[in-house]
Interface confidence: low
């Protein structure tokens, strides 16, 4: 398994963010596919569950992310994004997400860095 | 407006150290980690590591382990690249750069020249 | 580590042709980003994720391509787009950078 992501994202304060995540696998795509999302906080801090995806969706039932995650992907077409709503600074920080097709070999995980921003996006500066 | 201003030239010999600046400003300097990368004459670009200015985590460039040290200030918003036991293969510019969604805001470079 | 070759090593067009820049990379990436560098600058990026366009940058560039073969396009070159174009990867630990284009005045 092949994971793809970019590199980082900026999302403003308050607004969702999409999670982008694809993946190649040289195995069919069915019932054995698992997807996890994890955080991981900028300041360090402990690694916290975001996400879990195996033939259903299943969302956090406790923590920061609960009830503020939802499944935005289609395994059928190779994605395994999320949709993170409601942003918070305490947001920043990388998300890893980690696809597992047996009986293809487990990939590297991919990351994300999520920069939640004030409402000015540094995509709207130019450049210097 | 972001700006990431660097320390200016420097000349070594072989064996010494060097420590190069990067002070940032413009935008919260702890969103977002501070990549240095290092461009040798005439050569291309080659990422030496990164570092989260948040905790001081630090993630390497395999080829650039143990005489390379990154580090940050957080309270002057400036970021550091100290290089130790210099050779001459070291002479480059060495950029700091901060990677956002769509652009990157690099410093204007810093030439390290290490000559006996 | 990735590896990213970039051909040809120095194209020699005339202002107002179209140039086509390629980066092939040695095993599959996500995604391209590419950069711009004129001598005694900082490189300048142009195209992140493949095919956006950093701000400001002109619609004569766009970028294309997946797997391991990625491709910057200048559709009519202007006199202030000869410089070296870089690629780079960020699919893998670390990020790497091809060697450069030179694109130089024919």
């Known amino acids: 398994v092949e994971i793809y992501t970019s590199r980082v994202l900026e999302a403003v304060n308050g607004t969702d963010a999409r999670l982008k995540c694809t993946f190649s696998s040289f195995a069919p795509v069915g019932d054995a596919l698992t997807v996890t999302w994890n955080f991981r906080p900028l300041d360090g801090g402990p690694e916290q569950f975001v996400f879990y995806y195996h033939i259903d969706p299943f969302q956090p039932m406790s923590g920061r992310f609960k009830d503020r995650v939802s499944w935005d992907g289609n395994p059928e077409r190779y994605d395994a994004s999320i949709l993170l709503w409601k942003l918070q600074f305490d947001d920043n920080g990388t998300y890893t997400c980690q696809v597992k097709n047996p009986p293809d070999v487990d990939g590297v995980i991919g990351e994300i860095r999520l920069s939640v921003v004030h409402t000015v996006r540094f995509s709207e500066i130019h450049f210097l | 407006q972001v700006q990431l201003v660097q320390s200016g030239s420097e000349l070594k010999k072989p064996g010494a150290s060097v420590k190069v600046s990067c002070k940032a400003s413009?935008?919260?300097?702890?969103?977002?980690?501070m990549h240095w990368v290092r461009q040798a004459p005439g050569q291309g670009l080659e990422w030496i590591g990164e570092?989260?200015?948040?905790?001081?985590?630090?993630d390497y460039n395999e080829g650039f382990t143990g005489r390379f040290v990154l580090s940050v200030d957080k309270s002057s918003s400036t970021a550091y690249l100290q290089i130790s036991s210099l050779k001459a293969e070291d002479t480059a510019v060495y950029y700091c750069?901060?990677?956002?969604?769509?652009?990157?805001?690099w410093g204007q470079g810093t030439l390290v020249t290490v000559s006996s | 580590e990735i590896v990213l070759t970039q051909s040809p090593a120095t194209l020699s067009l005339s202002p107002g042709e179209r140039a086509t820049l390629s980066c092939r990379a040695s095993?599959?990436?996500?995604?391209m980003y590419w950069y711009q560098q004129k001598p005694g600058q900082a490189p300048r990026p142009l195209i992140y994720?493949?095919?956006n366009r950093a701000t400001g940058i002109p619609a004569r560039f766009s970028g294309s391509g997946s797997g391991t073969d990625y491709t910057l396009t200048i559709s009519s070159l202007e006199p202030e787009d000869f410089a070296v174009y870089y690629c780079?990867?960020?699919?893998?630990?670390?990020?790497?950078f091809g060697q450069g284009t030179k694109l130089e005045i024919k």
């Open positions: 750069t901060i990677y956002t969604t769509a652009l990157d805001y």
């Open positions: 570092i989260n200015p948040t905790n001081g985590g630090t």
């Open positions: 994720v493949t095919s």
């Open positions: 413009g935008y919260t300097f702890t969103n977002y980690w």
């Open positions: 095993s599959s990436v996500g995604y």
């Open positions: 780079q990867q960020w699919s893998s630990n670390p990020p790497t």
